[in-house]
Interface confidence: low
Amino acid sequence: ILGGREAEAHARPYMASVQVNGEHLCGGVLVAEQWVLSAAHCLEDAADGKVQVLLGAHSLSQPEPSKRLYDVLRAVPHPDSRPDTIDHDLLLLQLSEKATLGPAVRPLPWQRVDRDVEPGTLCDVAGWGIVSHAGRRPDRLQHVLLPVLDRATCNRRTHHDGAITQRMMCAESNRRDSCKGDSGGPLVCGGVLEGVVTSGSRVCGNRKKPGIYTRVASYAAWIDSVLA
């Protein structure tokens, strides 16, 4: 997260760290007792490592009573996701067992009504992604509030040049932005999961390259079919 601040500890109990060989790789969001939603491209970066999900964490390194690392039983990328595009960039991870729920571990309701968030709405994005262009990685969860940007502006030739589909949304990126390592994490508007940070190699913090988020409401049928 660029231009953000440290989050209040455990105030986002839905927040997950998708890890490979014990290292944070991507963000994720607990959407059901045994399922974490993240970004499909995160799996590509996993190579042959062991994928696990950390729940109940604020600090990645310090012992915390609520922290628990879960093995992944099943990884379900969206069937139309492809390495060369950010379309359908969603991944559902089934934990090896139901998460132990509590004040620091709790699923987040996700948006099922398929309509765009009003431009200008302030939404919260959080993650353990880099906090500087030099690539410094935080130990504790960071967050930032970002205004939603209308799709027409986001699709301008100077911005994302038509790449933003109806199934994506944008947020402003003027020095405050999600960045590398935040992919798969939640964009939360009014206490509801609206978007998932896409995992393209986009430049961060440049106002002409807004943050791109996959709209979960657009994938409600797929999410329901996997969680069924």
């Epitope: 490979v20 799996l43 190579a47 042959d48 039983l73 099943r74 990884a75 379900v76 069924a228």
Partner: antibody
Framework: EVKLVESGGGLVQPGGSLKLSCATS????????MAWVRQAPGKGPEWVAF????????YYVDIVMGRFTISRENAKNTLYLEMSSLRSEDTAMYYC?????????????WGQGTSVTVSS | DIQMNQSPSSLSASLGDTITITCHAS??????LSWYQQKPGNIPELLIY???NLHTGVPSRFSGNRSGTSFTLTISSLQPEDIGTYFC?????????FGAGTKLELR
């Protein structure tokens, strides 16, 4: 057309080792989890081992844990099962099977099998 | 481990009959149940996955249903080529486990 062809079976003495191979074609191997399933004569199938598409997850049935190792070589579209400390109860037809896309755990295509007999 | 109790163990039916095979899981497996057919001397072949989804090329006379932890495979209008042994398999958690099988014969 999806094709799975097992090889490497044979007669082996108790305590011996074998390495089974499964050559695949007709699908993008690296997209799919793979499994080995065995079937003793006159019995039902028994799932033995699973490996995820990127080889980050491995699962084994308890009775082969520590004796069998599943692996894959995505560049060669090939699945392997290394078996050691073999016992008479490991005698079976061993099938390589493709696991439903993205880890939905059913076996949608099976090879013709390779026979393993453990006997002195 | 999840036990899969399959019944009956054998079944005799006539051509054109509708038959039902049942599988009961020892714990909740959601929809993660598959059915396989194994013809004599042949390999197992997938019929149904995720409780009720027909695999490619499987005739529509085969159908699957779920009621809680009980699952049924129904074959309507039995054909000669349907003779063989049918197995259920749970895919909820490892180890993956199969039912003991139902041998279907022509009366």
């Amino acid at each position: 057309e999806v094709k799975l062809v097992e090889s490497g079976g044979g007669l082996v003495q108790p305590g011996g080792s074998l390495k089974l191979s499964c050559a695949t074609s007709g699908f993008t191997f690296s997209d799919y989890g793979m499994a080995w399933v065995r079937q003793a004569p006159g019995k039902g199938p028994e799932w033995v081992a699973f490996i995820s598409n990127l080889a980050y997850s491995f699962y084994y049935v308890d009775i082969v844990m520590g004796r069998f190792t599943i692996s894959r070589e995505n560049a060669k579209n090939t699945l392997y099962l290394e078996m050691s400390s073999l016992r008479s109860e490991d005698t079976a037809m061993y099938y390589c099977a493709r696991v439903g896309l993205y880890g939905n755990f059913f076996m949608d295509y099976w090879g013709q099998g390779t026979s393993v007999t453990v006997s002195s | 481990d999840i036990q899969m109790n399959q019944s009956p163990s054998s079944l005799s039916a006539s051509l054109g009959d509708t038959i039902t095979i049942t599988c009961h899981a020892s714990q909740n497996i959601n929809v993660w149940l598959s059915w396989y057919q194994q013809k004599p001397g042949n390999i197992p072949e997938l019929l149904i996955y995720k409780a009720s989804n027909l695999h490619t090329g499987v005739p529509s006379r085969f159908s699957g249903n779920r009621s809680g932890t009980s699952f049924t495979l129904t074959i309507s209008s039995l054909q000669p080529e349907d003779i063989g042994t049918y197995f259920c398999q749970q895919g909820q958690s490892y180890p993956l486990t199969f039912g003991a099988g139902t041998k279907l014969e022509l009366r």
